[in-house]
């Protein structure tokens, strides 16, 4: 039995330059206890996009909409999208550890592609 599922329902999202991109992520449980972070890319070189607990992410807002009892919404919106934002975004659950939190489970990823700004 899975302890928790990380659900990124959209494999890909296409957004026009200058618009906002909504990246969806839902989880089935808060347990194990620990933070949720968003990254672009995978592996050692991945880029932190959003961490609720610390850091400054002026282009990112949270967009929780799900009110179902067994779906916790950890979706984000990134404003003013540029071609440099293209890539695959991962919603990642961490488990509280000592001294450092441990990566527990990642969503399957959502590929963001950026269309040219309509003229």
């Amino acid at each position: 039995e899975d302890e928790l599922q990380v659900i990124q329902p959209e494999k890909s999202v296409s957004v026009a330059a200058g618009e906002s991109a909504t990246l969806r992520c839902a989880m089935t449980s808060l347990i194990p206890v620990g933070p949720i972070m968003w990254f672009r890319g995978a592996g050692a070189g991945r880029e932190l996009i959003y961490n609720q607990k610390e850091g400054h992410f002026p282009r990112v807002t949270t967009v929780s909409e799900l009110t179902k009892r067994n779906n916790l919404d950890f979706s984000i919106s990134i404003s003013n999208i540029t071609p440099a934002d293209a890539g695959t975004y991962y919603c990642v659950k961490f488990r509280k550890g000592s001294p450092d939190d441990v990566e527990f489970k990642s969503g399957a990823g959502t590929e963001l592609s950026v269309r040219a700004k309509p003229s």
């Epitope: 039995e1 899975d2 302890e3 928790l4 089935t28 449980s29 808060l30 347990i31 194990p32 206890v33 620990g34 933070p35 949720i36 609720q52 949270t62 967009v63 929780s64 009110t67 009892r69 067994n70 779906n71 916790l72 919404d73 950890f74 979706s75 984000i76 488990r95 509280k96």
Partner: antibody, heavy 118, light 112 residues
Framework: EVQLVESGGGLVKPGGSLRLSCAAS????????MSWVRQTPGKGLEWVAT????????YYPDSVKGRFTLSRDNAKNSLYLQMNSLRAEDTAVYYC???????????WGQGTTVTVSS | DIVITQSPASLAVSLGERATISCRAS??????????MHWYQQKPGQPPKLLIY???NLESGVPDRFSGSGSRTDFTLTINPLQAEDVATYYC??????????FGGGTKVEIK
Amino acid sequence: EVQLVESGGGLVKPGGSLRLSCAASGFTFSSYVMSWVRQTPGKGLEWVATISSGGTYTYYPDSVKGRFTLSRDNAKNSLYLQMNSLRAEDTAVYYCASSVDGSAFDYWGQGTTVTVSS
Amino acid sequence: DIVITQSPASLAVSLGERATISCRASESVDSYGMSFMHWYQQKPGQPPKLLIYRASNLESGVPDRFSGSGSRTDFTLTINPLQAEDVATYYCHQSSENLPWTFGGGTKVEIK
């Protein structure tokens, strides 16, 4: 119909042990986070322990950490709380509670009373 | 620990009127726009019953005269209109990432 039935409470001397059980029915037990919450007239409601749906992760407040151990048997739809080194301040009604998402407690049992006294 | 201050400790309201209960947390219980504050009703001799989850979501089967609002540190449970069967003690509970999870001290609601 969801049912949570606690058992195992009773009178025990300080320093003694008790094992509480909670039998669950009416829902998919193995998908739910399970907890114990206790209630005393003086202190109100106090969270005691939580275990993840698969049983891998357990959490306790400092007041019981190292003395209480929470476990579950998903094949038997059962939850267990082993309470050791009991103190007078552990006297309370102990409720078993389920949570589909690990946040709010959806359903509660009727409770079992634990009295720690010499 | 996150301390929850619940007020008032007791409340007497006329039938058909509005009852309002407040809970204030010592720090934010929000994450990703969700508020991990919940409300329960407990009648004498019974276990608590979930009314509202995540600040404002009505639990299935709960009458819509119960409503919840608030975010971050300040939360409110409203019963409007109050009915005789609502006489009970009400508790708030936070389940944020910051353990331990904690409860408010309770509010006893009576009929005036």
